[in-house]
Amino acid sequence: PKQTLPKPIIRAESTYMVPKEKQATLCCQGSYGAVEYQLHFEGSLFAVERPKPPERINGVKFHIPDMNSRKAGRYSCIYRVGELWSERSDLLDLVVTEMYDTPTLSVHPGPEVTSGEKVTFYCRLDTATSMFLLLKEGRSRDVQRSYGKVQAEFPMGPVTTAHRGSYRCFGSYNNYAWSFPSEPVKLLVTGDIENTSLAPTDPTFPDSWDTCLLTRETGLQKDLALWDHTAQNLLR
């Protein structure tokens, strides 16, 4: 069998949801000594980076300016050390947002509920779309999908204090082109005193792991980088 290097890690810097005309930054974390990194889009070569000097850096950033629906889709990356190529990274879905209109998000029976109550979110968008998405702030990878002509329902079932937080919805024109986000709706779930004090509120920062952990190598950093790579794999 053909020998390959370990697959790199691909990430979107800050977020995978990029407003149209803004810049996306994708990071490909590979290996010290890699002479070339390739970014692939929907199976075709998109861009090439050659780090300088290759032995001193463990990855690269690919900048994608002027985001639009033609650049939204599935990305992956590979790298090369000498003549040997790596396996392909996992796929990363890059989404363009702020397309067309803004949906309206509402919640029933209301934004303040008691633990155990059944809650339903409603996302409405009058322009032609059939798929709707609901995201919780700080949890943008956990996307809920629902379908409807102008409105979709997101039944949450009996809620707990873990459901507390800020929600937004999007209309989707395809898997990778989303509308403007709705105004946020903050869900407040009250429970008994014990539960409330124990339940942590969600972080307000989005997707704290979506950062590019690329390092320049000093003597000490080789071990740190290896530890970091192992830690990231354990987290996934």
Partner: nanobody, 126 residues
Framework: EVQLVESGGGEVQPGGSLRLSCAAS????????MGWFRQAPGKEREFVAA???????YYAESVKGRFTISRDNAKNTVYLQMSSLRAEDTAVYYC????????????????????WGQGTLVTVKP
């Protein structure tokens, strides 16, 4: 707004050479990644060569060793030196730019490019 104007196309015999030029307007040229694409009659537009803002280059396999891309930031111009031309190189050649770029990426996919020229025709025939 960036405007790109290609020149240097024409008719040449197989084995001959041509140099295409692409003049860019605006002060953003030094921060642009540039590329050349071509479209033969009845075919899809295809990648030919590209150059990053830091002068790294990348070529399509079909032109490697025969074509050379270069840039002159002082003249806001990118060049495509074509030699050992073949009949299959006959096409309209387009210059394209990715503006702005912040790294040293070489862009290969046409979707990456946000500015395009009108094209210049290259015909290779005996």
């Amino acid at each position: 707004e960036v405007q790109l104007v290609e020149s240097g196309g024409g008719e040449v015999q197989p084995g001959g050479s041509l140099r295409l030029s692409c003049a860019a307007s605006g002060r953003t040229f030094a921060s642009a990644a540039m590329g050349w694409f071509r479209q033969a009659p009845g075919k899809e537009r295809e990648f030919v060569a590209a150059i990053s803002r830091s002068d790294d280059t990348y070529y399509a396999e079909s032109v490697k060793g025969r074509f050379t891309i270069s840039r002159d930031n002082a003249k806001n111009t990118v060049y495509l030196q074509m030699s050992s031309l073949r009949a299959e190189d006959t096409a309209v050649y387009y210059c394209a730019a990715v503006v702005p770029t912040y790294g040293s990426s070489i862009y290969v996919h046409s979707a990456a490019y946000n500015y395009w020229g009108q094209g210049t025709l290259v015909t290779v025939k005996p």
